[in-house]
């Protein structure tokens, strides 16, 4: 065909409002004189003696010019049909990247402006290198590589196996039949890391302790199951109808609240962050509710079988908290991380 096919569906040619457009008759050889008509309209738009051969020139197109055009050779044989669609070249897409763990990150994008045309995105990334490697050939380990687009979520690609300490450059190029436009974004995993909120938050009363609540939770499922880098947590709680949250930073995966308001239900929520403060705090987990126990502590049952109970008096000094689950960082990785 003498008409180079722009990216997009066959038989469609593209233009920009307010600009000239040159349409091309697809079924004839280059330079063959043709007549042009609007589909369904017998009025001649451009005759075979125009000197433009198989091309139709429209000086300044606008929305009424969109539609189907028919070209015919001198002997009246149809040279084919062309549909003109108007739109705009791509603007730079807006790109942002997020990470919910320290090994992978995802980038999402949206068009800088709506082009009104069929659009696709080319996504790739490479590891940025330190300056000064003049004498060395660039290592293949720096890429570039494609950033695989998520088949289930449009406008998202995921980089797997990223290095926590490296910096990456993301390239998102928006392509449509009128052109291409590229956005670049430099990304450090340690800067964009924002864990998912902790999961499985439970709030339980502590029998016999009317001012205590025990909250426990687990790591978010998206965090690696045998983590080199740990999470730290922030816990907030408040009695029902109380506007202000109290905040504590627990040492592990549970916390005993010792100043709960007796008899009132309490809302509790937790947030997570990398244990060495990379990135930012997660969003808060969904609130869980719990009410301190109102009962008393059963004492030792005497030999004669009579049950003695004694009302609880909250001790001045709290009894030791239950042992924390051990999740200590791997010392070599800690050393490595401290040394950077």
């Amino acid at each position: 065909s003498p008409c180079p096919q722009a990216w997009g569906p066959p038989g469609v040619q593209y233009g920009q409002p307010g600009r000239p457009v040159m349409l091309c008759c697809p079924g004839v050889s280059a330079g063959t004189p043709v007549s042009w008509f609007r589909d369904g309209d017998s009025r001649l738009l451009q005759g075979p003696d125009s000197g433009l051969g198989h091309r139709l020139v429209l000086a300044q197109v606008d929305s009424p010019d969109e539609g189907t055009y028919v070209c015919q050779t001198l002997d009246g044989v149809s040279g084919g049909m062309v549909t003109l669609k108007l739109g705009f070249p791509p603007a730079r897409p807006e790109v942002s990247c997020q990470a919910v763990d320290y090994e992978n990150f995802s980038c999402t994008w949206s068009p800088g402006q709506v082009s009104g045309l069929p659009t696709r995105y080319l996504t790739s990334y490479r590891k940025k290198t330190l300056p000064g490697a003049e004498s060395q050939r660039e290592s293949p380990s720096t890429g570039p590589w494609p950033c695989p687009q998520d088949p289930l979520e449009a406008s998202r690609c995921v980089v797997h196996g990223a290095e926590f300490w490296s910096e990456y450059r993301i390239n998102v190029t928006e392509v449509n039949p009128l052109g291409a436009s590229t956005s670049l974004l430099d990304v450090r995993l340690q800067s964009i890391l924002r864990p998912d909120p902790p999961q499985g938050l439970r709030v339980e009363s502590v029998p016999g302790y009317p001012r205590r609540l025990r909250a426990s939770w687990t790591y978010p499922a998206s965090w690696p199951s045998q983590p080199h880098f740990l999470l730290k947590f922030r816990l907030q709680y408040r009695p029902a109808q109380h506007p202000a949250w109290s905040t504590v930073e627990p040492a592990g995966l549970e916390e005993v609240i010792t100043d709960a308001v007796a008899g009132l239900p309490h809302a509790v929520r937790v947030s997570a962050r990398d244990f060495l403060d990379a990135g930012t705090w997660s969003t808060w987990s969904p609130e869980a509710w719990g009410t301190p126990s109102t009962g008393t502590i059963p004492k030792e049952i005497p030999a004669w079988g009579q049950l003695h109970t004694q009302p609880e008096v909250e001790p001045q000094v709290d009894s030791p908290a239950p042992p924390r689950p051990s999740l200590q960082p791997h010392p070599r990785l800690l050393d490595h991380r401290d040394s950077v």
Epitope: R92, E94, V95, S96, R126, K128, T129, P131, G132, E134, R137, E138, T142, G143, P144, R169, N171, T173, A180, S181, T182, L184, L185, D186
Partner: antibody
């Protein structure tokens, strides 16, 4: 080896034109910002022009704006500087240089030229 | 785009330190952390010594260090050696027209 090789310099009359080329090798050219820097005989370095990896954005020193055009062909790993309306004060060694740049969500910034070519001499004289 | 201001010359004996200043404005040096320093020997292309104010490329000795305060950046060469005799240029992102700006250059002489 990471390398930049300039060509196209020479003697040209005032008002004339010249096109400089810079062939890049040993790195993924299409991912880097590139620039031209010049140095008049016995003088200091002067920033001339700068281009984004895709070629979509460019920048120029005030002294060359409207007369010089920077461009690149990523398929050929080549950077160009088209110079028109040349003046005697454009006489200099022209260096091509590479920059990794820094790109935030809002803008990209010139960072530092880490790789330089050997330079090509442009002499504007009648 | 006015050139950044550097002293025309600086000197020191081998083993001594020499500091070179680079003064700009809030639109260049003061406004961004994209200040770099280059060394140029006669007849050769410039070589990157410092980027992003304080960072050293691989292969550059730690005798070279950079800093910045306000609108003025500085390069310090400690433990001067004969091969440090060269011209030194600072550069900064210029904040306009996607352009940058170089300093006026400083010739460093190693005495003796």
């Amino acid at each position: 080896e990471v390398q930049l090789l300039e060509s196209g310099g020479g003697l040209v009359q005032p008002g004339g034109s010249l096109r400089l080329s810079c062939a890049a090798s040993g790195f993924t050219f299409s991912w880097y910002f590139m620039g031209w820097v010049r140095q008049a005989p016995g003088k200091g370095l002067e920033w001339v022009s700068y281009i984004y990896p895709s070629g979509g954005s460019t920048g120029y020193a005030d002294s060359v704006k409207g007369r010089f055009t920077i461009s690149r062909d990523n398929s050929k790993n080549t950077l160009y500087l088209q110079m028109h309306s040349l003046r005697a004060e454009d006489t200099a060694v022209y260096y091509c240089a590479r920059d990794e740049g820094y790109c935030s969500s809002t803008s990209c910034y010139f960072d530092a030229f880490d790789i330089w070519g050997q330079g090509t001499m442009v002499t504007v004289s009648s | 785009q006015s050139a950044l201001t550097q002293p025309p010359s600086a000197s020191g004996s081998p083993g001594q330190s020499v500091a070179i200043s680079c003064t700009g404005t809030s639109s260049d040096v003061g406004g961004y952390n994209f200040v770099s320093w280059y060394q140029q020997h006669p007849g050769k292309a410039p070589k990157l010594l410092i980027y992003e104010v304080t960072k050293r490329p691989s292969g550059v000795p730690d005798r070279f260090s950079g800093s910045k305060a306000g609108n003025t950046a500085s390069l310090t060469v400690s433990g001067l050696q004969a091969e440090d005799e060269a011209d030194y240029y600072c550069s900064s992102y210029g904040g306009s027209n996607n352009a940058g700006v170089f300093g006026t250059g400083t010739k460093v002489t190693v005495l003796g």
